[in-house]
C-alpha cells in the first residue's frame, strides 16, 4: 500500500505592485498532480510580517492572495499544498512548505524618515496630514508623500504640500472617492544631497480618524417645572445622525458642572425653579456604529440664559 | 457657519496703501487656504494670491506681486491683504475666499471689500 | 498662464430648458488624474458661489440640476431645468496651476 504524497506549490513569491502595503502572494500547482485529475487541491497559507507572533492562515483553491502588510518590516510566508480526504481514502495529505520572505531594503537610518506622523479625516471631507522631518536632516532634505486604496489604479502623490522652510511637512488630499472602510496606504520618502533617506509607511482606515465639526443651533425648552430639554443640530456635512455621540458640558449658576454623553440631539436636565444662569456646549463624536475609532470634535459655541426665570421663556440661539 | 468677514468699503488716495482684512470663524483657520480674488465693476475675476496660514507659505500671482502682501494672524482667525501704490485701476471688490487644496474650488467667500481710490 | 475662453458670452434659455455653457483651455487641467476645473455662479452684488469643482463633483448644497463635464482642455456646465433664480453670471476657474484663472464670464438669462 503506497503512500500517497504530493508536492508543495511551485513559484510561490511576494509580488509588489507599487499599492505601497498591498501584496500579492502567488504560487502555480504542484509538480505531478496527474494521480489527482478528479481532485480539487487545496492550499494552505500562512504569513505575517516579521516580527509578528502570529500568522494568518488561509486556506483556498485559488492561486493567489492579496492582503495588506507593514513595508515598515519584512514579510514571510509559507504555503503547503492539501489533498482533501475524499481524494486519498481517508486521511488528508498536506505537502511539505514552500516559503518566501519578501521586504524593501531601506536606505537611510532610522532616524531620518519622518516623525511624528499625523492624520485626521475632516468631517468625513478633508483628509489632512501632517509630520515633523527626520531627525538631524538637512534642509535640503524634502519628503513626498504616496497614498493609495483599492478603487485607484495606481499609488498617488499629494496634490497639495504643506510646507515649512521649503520642506514639506503636510499635505492636503485631493477628494477621496469611496475611500473609507477599506485600507488606506500612505508611504512618505524623501531625497536629500548629503544622505539617503528612509522611507515610512502607515496604513490606517478613514472612517477611524474623523473629526467632525461641533453641533450647531443649541436651544433650551423648558418641558414642566423642574425640566429643560437642551437641543441641538447635527452638523453641517455628510456625516449622518445615526453616527453621532454627544458629550455634553452643562453649568448651572456658575457653580455644577454636569457632563453626559447621549446618542441622539437632545438631553433633558432636571433642575430646580431657583436656576438663574444656564449654560452648555456639545461636541460631537463619530460613534461606534459607523467608525471603530473617532477624535472628538471641537467645542460648540457656548449658549447661555440668565437674568430671567427660565420657565418663562423658549430660548433659541 | 461658515463665515469670512470683511468691512464694506474703504476709500483711498491715490499712492496710499490699504489693508483690507477678512476675519474668518466657523472653521479651523489653518486647515483652509485662503485667496484674495479682484473683481473690477462689469469685468472678469482676478485671482491675487493666497496664503496657507498653516505654515504661511504664499503663492502670488506674477502681476499683484508688487501690488499685494499676503498676511494672516493665526491668533485672530484673520488674514489680511495690504495693497499699496494705490490708482485708480486698483479700484475693485476683493474678495477673500476659502479653499480646501486646489482640488476642491474655492468654497466660501467673503461679501468683498469695494475698494475706490480717488481724490 | 492657462487662459480660460468661454462661449457663449451671453445666452437665453426657456424655463424648463436646458442650458449648457463651455469652457476650454489654452492646455489640459488635468492633473494626477484630477481635473481642475471649478465653476462658479455669482448674482448682482454678491461674492461668487461655487457649483462645481473638480469638472464634476457638485459643491456643498448646489442643487442637482446643475452638473458638468469634461476633462482636459475642455469642460461645460449644465444646468436642466431652467428656473428662474438661474439667472446670473457663470465663471469658470483652473486650479491646476498658479496663477488660478477665470474665464471671461457667460451671462445667463430666461428667455
Known amino acids: 500500500d503506497t503512500e500517497i504524497k504530493v508536492n508543495p506549490p511551485q513559484d510561490f513569491e511576494i509580488v509588489d505592485p507599487g499599492y505601497l502595503g498591498y501584496l500579492y502572494l502567488q504560487w502555480q500547482p504542484p509538480l505531478s498532480l496527474d494521480h489527482f485529475k478528479e481532485c480539487t487541491v487545496e492550499y494552505e497559507l500562512k504569513y505575517r510580517n516579521i516580527g509578528s507572533e502570529t500568522w494568518k492562515t488561509i486556506i483556498t483553491k485559488n492561486l493567489h492572495y492579496k492582503d495588506g502588510f507593514d513595508l515598515n518590516k519584512g514579510i514571510e510566508a509559507k504555503i503547503h499544498t492539501l489533498l482533501p480526504w475524499q481524494c486519498t481514502n481517508g486521511s488528508e495529505v498536506q505537502s511539505s512548505w514552500a516559503e518566501t520572505t519578501y521586504w524593501i531594503s531601506p536606505q537611510g537610518i532610522p532616524e531620518t524618515k519622518v516623525q511624528d506622523m499625523d492624520c485626521v479625516y475632516y468631517n468625513w471631507q478633508y483628509l489632512l496630514c501632517s509630520w515633523k522631518p527626520g531627525i538631524g536632516v538637512l534642509l535640503d532634505t524634502n519628503y513626498n508623500l504616496f497614498y493609495w486604496y483599492e478603487g485607484l489604479d495606481h499609488a498617488l502623490q499629494c496634490v497639495d504640500y504643506i510646507k515649512a522652510d521649503g520642506q514639506n511637512i503636510g499635505c492636503r488630499f485631493p477628494y477621496l472617492e469611496a475611500s473609507d472602510y477599506k485600507d488606506f496606504y500612505i508611504c512618505v520618502n524623501g531625497s536629500s544631497e548629503n544622505k539617503p533617506i528612509r522611507s515610512s509607511y502607515f496604513t490606517f482606515q478613514l472612517q477611524n480618524i474623523v473629526k467632525p465639526l461641533p453641533p450647531v443651533y443649541l436651544t433650551f425648552t423648558r418641558e414642566s417645572s423642574c425640566e429643560i430639554k437642551l437641543k441641538w443640530s447635527i452638523p453641517l456635512g455628510p456625516i449622518p445622525a445615526r453616527c453621532f455621540d454627544y458629550e455634553i458640558e452643562i453649568r448651572e449658576d456658575d457653580t455644577t458642572l454636569v457632563t453626559a454623553t447621549v446618542e441622539n440631539e437632545t438631553y433633558t436636565l432636571k433642575t430646580t425653579n431657583e436656576t438663574r444662569q444656564l449654560c452648555f456646549v456639545v461636541r460631537s463624536k463619530v460613534n461606534i456604529y459607523c467608525s471603530a475609532d473617532g477624535i472628538w470634535s471641537e467645542w460648540s459655541d457656548k449658549q447661555c440664559w440668565e437674568g430671567e426665570d427660565l420657565s418663562k421663556k423658549t430660548l433659541l440661539r | 457657519q461658515v463665515q469670512l468677514q470683511q468691512p464694506g468699503a474703504e476709500l483711498v488716495r491715490p499712492g496710499a496703501s490699504v489693508k483690507l482684512s477678512c476675519k474668518a470663524s466657523?472653521?479651523?483657520?489653518?486647515?483652509?487656504?485662503m485667496n484674495w480674488v479682484k473683481q473690477r465693476p462689469e469685468q472678469d475675476l482676478d485671482w491675487i494670491g493666497r496664503i496657507d496660514p498653516y505654515d504661511g507659505d504664499i503663492d502670488y500671482n506674477q502681476n499683484f506681486k508688487d501690488k499685494a502682501i499676503l498676511t494672516v494672524d493665526k491668533s485672530s482667525s484673520t488674514a489680511y491683504m495690504q495693497l499699496s501704490s494705490l490708482t485708480s485701476e486698483d479700484s475693485a471688490v476683493y474678495y477673500c475666499?476659502?479653499?480646501?487644496?486646489?482640488?476642491?474650488?474655492?468654497?466660501?467667500w467673503g461679501q468683498g471689500t469695494s475698494v475706490t481710490v480717488s481724490s | 498662464d492657462i487662459v480660460l475662453t468661454q462661449s457663449p458670452a451671453s445666452l437665453a434659455v426657456s424655463l424648463g430648458q436646458r442650458a449648457t455653457i463651455s469652457c476650454r483651455a489654452s492646455?489640459?487641467?488635468?492633473?494626477?488624474?484630477?481635473?481642475?476645473m471649478n465653476w462658479f455662479q455669482q448674482k448682482p452684488g454678491q461674492p461668487p458661489k461655487l457649483l462645481i469643482y473638480?469638472?464634476?463633483r457638485q459643491g456643498s448644497g448646489v442643487p442637482a440640476r446643475f452638473s458638468g463635464s469634461g476633462s482636459g482642455t475642455d469642460f461645460s456646465l449644465n444646468i436642466h431645468p431652467m428656473e428662474e433664480d438661474d439667472t446670473a453670471m457663470y465663471f469658470c476657474q483652473q486650479s491646476k496651476e498658479v496663477p488660478w484663472t477665470f474665464g471671461g464670464g457667460t451671462k445667463l438669462e430666461i428667455k
Open positions: 473638480a469638472a464634476s
Open positions: 475666499a476659502r479653499g480646501y487644496g486646489t482640488a476642491y474650488g474655492v468654497d466660501y
Open positions: 466657523g472653521y479651523t483657520f489653518s486647515n483652509y487656504l
Open positions: 492646455e489640459s487641467v488635468d492633473n494626477y488624474g484630477i481635473s481642475f
